[in-house]
């Protein structure tokens, strides 16, 4: 806390500019009017003002606006977001997306600090929804952005908003993600053609069902293995081996070197080794010749 | 990891002009920090001469007058130091450094740092 | 400008000892940070933000103080501790270092 003192004659600011970086603390809390600051907010960013004089300038802020800044100001604080802690940020109404721009730029090439956070948090709160325009925004600062939201939060992203994901976007996305998110893809690219669609889609595939596999298998678009080893285990182990062939075309060679990982160890032990074999990659642990083989699934289905 | 080099002529004459060069690595100068001049006279004593910012705007020492000037070529990540009309007052170590956060207050990353001697 | 008073200038200390030196401002700080420097080297940053420890250095290293009125602790002296420690603000411009402490091993 700043003591009160008296501003030195001749000291009293006029205005935010270069000179009050030569001024102490004290004078700074003495001699700037906090009214002033708010209003030239946008001065202080072109102020070199050391880290300890930005204390002083937030602690006016605070003094000024008790009840949280107004947008007005928080478009213009530049290096001093960094000193503001989340529960300084949970009083705030962002609404603006060139304010968060503005913020978010600031803390640009760093990670997403709890600021940060809560700031997005505030932001898309108060939209009610993800659009894309905002998705676009947070996902260009922070690739990993998507993949930081809870299944329950991702389900407030609408369709059309999937056009803005990069798929470095989905690097970090656990299967429960993209199980929100592949639906939305689906829906978001369903007017595209095959070879088209197939670009958009693959970095959700993660979240497809059996039965779009399936679809895909039969349109020759040659998923490479590192796509293929990101899909539901349960939705790669109903494939046969004909289908797996034709989803990965020239890929399937790959195979072989994966045989020890899932979901392909999975798979291949719910195959006839009579069909690997046709693969002629040598993948070994298929149901031997012979062998009656029983879905217990439909089993139970019928019980 | 960031790393900074100075470089530049260990002798200069009374009067003349001292130049050195600050070499960085491992960080852009454009990105959001302060690059620092910094020397170390031979009592050990040290003081900060300037910074050049991100933004390419400046900032002096008001002991060095209108003697300093630091400017920087961003195609090849370098900043540097131009202290003019030297005496043998400015024989010291100078060493370039770089800020620890998004404003001013503590110096993370120095130089080896490269002495100068002001004789005739 | 603000002047930092460091004390003692010299001093030395035993392996295993306790060692704290003091540095003083003229004006009221919010943060102080300490260097090591070992001749022939360059200031190395010891503790930034009055308290806390920059990367890679040893636990044994500490900072405190408020106002006016900074210390920096070595809780168990080490030969390669041997080095002069420099205090530093930058409250307001310019910054400014202490005058050092020279600490020796006994």
């Known amino acids: 806390e700043v003591e009160k003192t008296a501003c030195p004659s001749g000291k009293k600011a006029r205005e935010i500019d270069e000179s009050l970086i030569f001024y102490k603390k004290w004078e700074l809390e003495a001699c700037v009017d906090a009214a002033l600051l708010a209003t030239q907010m946008d001065r202080v960013n072109a102020i070199p003002f050391t880290y300890e004089q930005l204390d002083v300038l937030k602690h006016k802020l605070d003094e000024l606006y008790p009840q949280g800044y107004p947008e007005s100001v928080i478009q213009h604080l530049g290096y001093l977001f960094l000193k503001m802690s989340p529960e300084d940020i949970r009083k705030w109404n962002v609404t603006s997306l060139e304010t968060l721009k503005a913020l978010l730029e600031v803390n640009k090439g760093h990670e997403m600090s709890p600021q940060v956070a809560t700031l997005i948090d505030r932001f898309v709160k108060g939209r009610g929804q993800l659009d894309k325009d905002t998705l676009d925004t947070l996902t260009a600062f922070y690739p990993g952005y998507l993949c930081s939201l809870s299944p329950e939060e991702l389900s407030s992203v609408p369709p059309s908003s999937i056009w803005a994901v990069r798929p470095q976007d989905l690097d970090t996305c656990d299967p429960r993600q993209l199980d929100v998110l592949y639906p939305k893809a689906r829906l978001a690219f369903q007017n595209m053609n095959g070879s088209e669609y197939f670009v958009k889609i693959q970095s959700f595939l993660g979240g497809a069902p059996t039965e779009d596999l399936k679809a895909l298998s039969q349109q020759n678009v040659s998923m490479d293995l590192a796509t293929f080893m990101k899909l539901r285990t349960d939705a790669v182990l109903p494939l046969t081996v004909a289908e797996v062939q034709k989803l990965l075309g020239p890929h399937v060679e790959g195979l072989k070197a994966e045989e020890r990982h899932r979901p392909v160890r999975d798979w291949i032990l719910r195959q006839r080794q009579d069909d690997l074999d046709t693969l002629g990659l040598g993948l070994q642990g298929g149901i031997p010749n012979g062998y009656l083989v029983l879905d217990l699934s439909m089993q139970e289905a019928l019980s | 990891d960031v790393q900074l080099q100075e470089s530049g002529p260990g002798l200069v004459k009374p009067s003349q002009s001292l130049s050195l060069t600050c070499s960085v690595t491992g960080d852009s100068i454009t990105s959001g920090y302060y690059w620092n001049w910094i020397r170390q006279f031979p009592g050990n004593k040290l003081e900060w001469m300037g910074f050049i910012r991100f933004d390419g705007t400046n900032n002096y020492n008001p002991s060095l007058k209108n003697r300093i000037s630091i400017t920087r070529d961003t195609s090849k990540n370098q900043f540097f130091l131009k202290l003019n009309s030297v005496t043998t007052e400015d024989t010291a170590t100078y060493y370039c450094?770089?800020?620890?956060?998004?404003?001013?207050?503590?110096?993370?990353?120095w130089g080896q740092g490269t002495l100068v001697t002001v004789s005739a | 400008q603000i002047v930092l008073t460091q004390s003692p200038a010299i001093m030395s200390a035993s392996p295993g000892e306790k060692v704290t030196m003091t540095c003083s401002a003229s004006?009221?700080?919010?943060?102080m940070y300490w260097y090591q420097q070992k001749p022939g080297s360059s200031p190395r940053l010891l503790i930034y933000?009055?308290?806390n420890l920059a990367s890679g250095v040893p636990v044994r290293f500490s900072g405190s103080g408020s106002g006016t009125s900074y210390s920096l602790t070595i809780s168990r002296m080490e030969a390669e501790d041997a080095a002069t420690y420099y205090c530093q603000q930058w409250s307001s411009y310019p910054p400014t270092f202490g005058g050092g402490t020279k600490l020796e091993i006994k």
């Open positions: 004006s009221s700080l919010s943060y």
């Open positions: 933000d009055t308290s």
């Open positions: 450094a770089r800020e620890g956060s998004y404003a001013p207050a503590w110096f993370a990353y």
